[in-house]
């Protein structure tokens, strides 16, 4: 990842958007922005629940942990955190619940040590594909990000820009292959109906993936094969009906994986037989004894682990001539 000692000279050819921030007088070492609380000893700045409409320009250079939660930022422009000298130590940035609806390309540029970013609970109607990569090059400089928290960033239905929300988020995750070093990705509570098939293959360093509380119906086209280091996969509270053989085999092949599958509407018919057999043998699934059938009605609340092949039947499809209206 980027060196945490970028020199100010790297700003000399910056785009115009940097002008105001970069030309500002550098803050005094002990200066704390208005409406914020600062601790130099803890290297922490908290600007919390202050209805700020923009990122303070006079952040102290020592800041390592920056909390900008509960504000009214609306838009994060390019270079929102670019300063001279740069915020070279900033490692953790929390922007959750700050009414952000737009994050522009290059919003997090010039933060060479940024390891953890939390944008949760913002209605992100417009997340630039280059929000995290900073450039539109096919291969960008690697982002230093290791943890990216994007829980509940789905905007209200009427604010979505007539495009796939899943596609918009994934485009930002994959742009320029900048996030190859990402190890924790949280995408819970985003109404995802599907997971684009190429997203996981391009995040090979993932250790923790949280997709809980979405609306995922199937993982048929999702490949986990490359995720050698994946340790936790949270799929609780989705709309999964069954996991098929290919998915089961891939999960079983991951040496350290723990999968969480609670509260999905499992359909216990003949298509469930392979999954039930696998569940009985695997140590991969946490709390597997809690998984129960939701459909068909006659199977509701039956424990998957207690089913046998005789329980898992599919109603025969009647030929058209025998169907009643």
């Amino acid at each position: 990842s980027s060196s945490p000692t970028s020199s100010a000279s790297s700003f000399s050819s910056s785009a115009p958007f940097l002008a105001s921030a970069v030309s500002a007088q550098p803050p005094l070492p002990d200066q704390c922005p208005a409406l914020c609380e600062c601790s130099e000893a803890a290297r922490t700045v908290k600007c919390v629940n202050r209805n700020l409409t923009e990122v303070p320009t006079d952040l102290p250079a020592y800041v390592r942990n920056l909390f900008l939660t509960g504000n009214q930022l609306a838009v994060l422009p390019a270079g929102a955190f670019a300063r001279r000298p740069p915020l070279a130590e900033l490692a953790a940035l929390n922007l959750s619940g700050s009414r952000l609806d737009e994050v522009r390309a290059g919003a997090f540029e010039h933060l060479p040590s940024l390891r953890q970013l939390d944008l949760s609970h913002n209605p992100l109607a417009d997340l630039s594909p280059f929000a995290f990569s900073g450039s539109n090059a096919s291969v960008s400089a690697p982002s230093p990000l290791v943890e990216l928290i994007l829980n509940h960033i789905v905007p209200p239905e009427d604010e979505r820009q007539n495009r796939s929300f899943e596609g918009m988020v994934v485009a930002a995750l994959l742009a320029g292959r900048a996030l190859q070093g990402l190890r924790r990705l949280e995408l819970a509570s985003n109404h995802f109906l599907y997971l684009p098939r190429d997203v996981l293959a391009q995040l090979p360093s993932l250790r923790h993936l949280d997709l809980s509380n979405n609306s995922l119906v199937s993982l048929t086209y999702v490949s986990f094969r490359n995720l050698t280091h994946l340790e936790s996969l949270h799929l609780e509270d989705n709309a999964l009906k069954v996991l098929h053989n290919g998915t089961l085999a891939e999960l079983q092949g991951l040496p350290h994986i723990r999968v969480f599958l609670d509260n999905n509407p499992w359909v216990c018919d003949c298509h469930m037989a392979d999954m039930v057999t696998w569940l009985k043998e695997t140590e991969v699934v946490q709390g597997k004894d809690r998984l129960t059938c939701a459909y068909p009605e006659k199977m509701r609340n039956r424990v998957l682990l207690e089913l046998n092949s005789a329980d898992l039947d599919c109603d025969p499809i009647l030929p058209p001539s025998l169907q009643t209206s």
């Epitope: 990842s1 060196s3 945490p4 040590s113 390891r115 290791v146 943890e147 070093g181 190890r183 924790r184 360093s205 250790r207 923790h208 280091h229 340790e231 936790s232 040496p255 350290h256 994986i257 723990r258 140590e283 991969v284 946490q286």
Partner: antibody, heavy 114, light 113 residues
Framework: SVEESGGRLVTPGTPLTLTCTAS????????MSWVRQAPGKGLEWIGI?????STYYASWAKGRCTISKTSTTVDLKITSPTTEDTAAYFC????????????WGQGTLVTVSS | AQVLTQTPSSVSAAVGGTVTINCQSS????????LSWYQQKPGQPPKLLIY???TLASGVPSRFKGSGSGTQFTLTISGVQSDDAATYYC?????????????FGGGTEVVVK
């Protein structure tokens, strides 16, 4: 926190099991490692056990040491100790994101002598 | 097996001075930056100072700085204080198809005059 126990004086060849007890976190969510330090010497990595139980060992420790776990403890078994195994043995938790030892026990002393 | 070579093995510094400790790995650490630094005082377990090559652990003073990537890493202590007298170890993490491997450097004793 983590706390090691089981260190004592043993004669060469007598199997010895050290135990690391974890409190305040779940061992199923963390990797745990054993590290040793001979008197007046540096740190030496022994091996590691993953959240789900996979184990990896230093080349010198394969066949000489075995790491296992329960829901609350991680054990290190030294199958046939020699005098060269005299050391303080530390148990350490591995960060859930980074591959670094971010929580250490105080260590337990093993002395192998005839 | 991977080897971490730490230099020097011992260094002396005056209060307020600067100490530089080098750590060279026989092969690249995982993701080029899985290198940690620890401080150990007599009779105590090691204490994590820096992880991910350059990230300061919680509560560690900013006079400690880690840098480097791949196979070459450095720990710098600026404005050395008497409390910094200790032995410092680097630790690398490695991954291959056969699994994980960790290694420690031989240690550097820092004496504060």
């Amino acid at each position: 926190s983590v706390e090691e126990s089981g260190g004592r004086l043993v004669t060469p060849g007598t199997p010895l099991t050290l135990t690391c007890t974890a409190s305040g976190f779940s061992l199923s969510s963390y990797w745990m490692s054993w590290v040793r330090q001979a008197p007046g010497k540096g740190l030496e990595w022994i091996g590691i056990i993953a959240g789900r139980g996979s184990t990896y060992y230093a080349s010198w420790a394969k066949g000489r040491c075995t790491i296992s776990k329960t829901s609350t403890t991680v054990d290190l078994k030294i199958t046939s100790p020699t005098t060269e195994d005299t050391a303080a043995y530390f148990c350490a938790r591995v960060s859930s994101i980074y591959y670094t030892f971010n929580l250490w026990g105080q260590g337990t002393l093993v002395t192998v002598s005839s | 097996a991977q080897v971490l070579t730490q230099t020097p093995s011992s260094v002396s510094a005056a209060v307020g001075g600067t100490v530089t400790i080098n750590c060279q790995s026989s092969q690249s650490v995982y993701s080029n930056n899985e290198l940690s630094w620890y401080q150990q005082k007599p009779g105590q377990p090691p204490k994590l100072l820096i992880y991910y090559a350059s990230t300061l652990a919680s509560g560690v003073p900013s006079r400690f700085k880690g840098s480097g990537s791949g196979t070459q890493f450095t720990l710098t202590i600026s404005g050395v204080q008497s409390d910094d007298a200790a032995t410092y170890y680097c630790q690398g993490s490695y991954y291959s198809g056969s699994g994980w491997y960790y290694a420690f450097g031989g240690g550097t004793e820092v004496v504060v005059k």
